[in-house]
Interface confidence: low
Amino acid sequence: DAEFRHDSGYEVHHQKLVFFAEDVGSNKGAIIGLMVGGVV
């Protein structure tokens, strides 16, 4: 899958959504989408 960057502060890597440091929330760095959900 193509990589692309959203202004909202995350990328999609092969359908895997990963946080960047500028995002807010209690679960910085957590992987979502691949597991059961979480912050985007």
């Epitope: 909202s8 995350y10 092969h14 807010v24 957590a30 989408g33 597991m35 959900g37 979480g38 985007v40």
Partner: antibody, heavy 121, light 111 residues
Framework: QVQLVQSGAEVKKPGASVKVSCKAS????????IHWVRQAPGQGLEWMGF????????NYNQKFKGRVTMTRDTSTSTVYMELSSLRSEDTAVYYC??????????????WGQGTLVTVSS | DIVMTQSPDSLAVSLGERATINCRAS??????????LNWYQQKPGQPPKLLIY???KQGTGVPDRFSGSGSGTDFTLTISSLQAEDVAVYYC?????????FGGGTKVEIK
């Protein structure tokens, strides 16, 4: 405590649209994605997509071919799922859900009570 | 899209006996040594409830009699000693990639 409260049952005619709401409380609204899952009568579960209350970005199941739109209103901590061009096969209970991140700790889920949408002429 | 197939469709087990449900994915749901496979329980008139995530990890508050195993494409949910309150439909689900997908469900009843 975390709560997701959905809007009430709807009856719609084929070709119409329906907009279901999901009001979140008990946590910081922008911290977790809200997913939508539907279940036709006597059938299994089908994931429709999710929206990010933080960014407003959504990811949809392509099965719905542009018929579904998920939005959020941060001022009321509410997420909306709109499904257009309704057909009889869209008759189902629609659930919103929030899932914890997997971060090596505990994971649990929170679901709305479900909204029955009936499509009938 | 990843297709999830469960077997059997229904299962009747005596109280206190073991129940085993199988789930197969059309392609591997593993990534970085983690299996992105979740199990849900759904009772009539209720929303689903997460039982097992990452193939083997118990959700919060889930009784120890529920366990999950497997990796790659083949997974199993085991109820070690069936209780009356375990009568429900059980679904597997992959969350490796979008769209997330569920198995067709397995109805567990008391024999």
């Amino acid at each position: 405590q975390v709560q997701l409260v959905q809007s009430g049952a709807e009856v719609k005619k084929p070709g119409a649209s329906v907009k279901v709401s999901c009001k979140a409380s008990g946590y910081t609204f922008t911290t977790y994605a809200i997913h939508w899952v539907r279940q036709a009568p006597g059938q299994g579960l089908e994931w429709m997509g999710f929206t990010s209350p933080y960014s407003g970005v959504s990811n949809y199941n392509q099965k719905f071919k542009g018929r579904v739109t998920m939005t959020r209103d941060t001022s009321t901590s509410t997420v909306y799922m709109e499904l257009s061009s309704l057909r009889s096969e869209d008759t189902a209970v629609y659930y919103c859900a929030r899932f914890d991140n997997y971060d090596g700790g505990y994971v649990r889920d929170y679901w709305g009570q479900g909204t029955l949408v009936t499509v009938s002429s | 899209d990843i297709v999830m197939t469960q077997s059997p469709d229904s299962l009747a087990v005596s109280l206190g006996e073991r129940a085993t449900i199988n789930c197969r994915a059309s392609e591997s749901v593993d990534n970085d040594r983690i299996s992105f496979l979740n199990w849900y329980q759904q009772k009539p008139g209720q929303p689903p409830k997460l039982l097992i995530y990452a193939a083997t990890k118990q959700g919060t508050g889930v009784p120890d009699r529920f366990s999950g195993s497997g990796s790659g494409t083949d997974f199993t949910l085991t109820i070690s000693s069936l209780q009356a309150e375990d009568v429900a439909v059980y679904y597997c689900q992959q969350s490796k990639e979008f769209p997330w997908s569920f198995g067709g469900g397995t109805k567990v009843e008391i024999k």
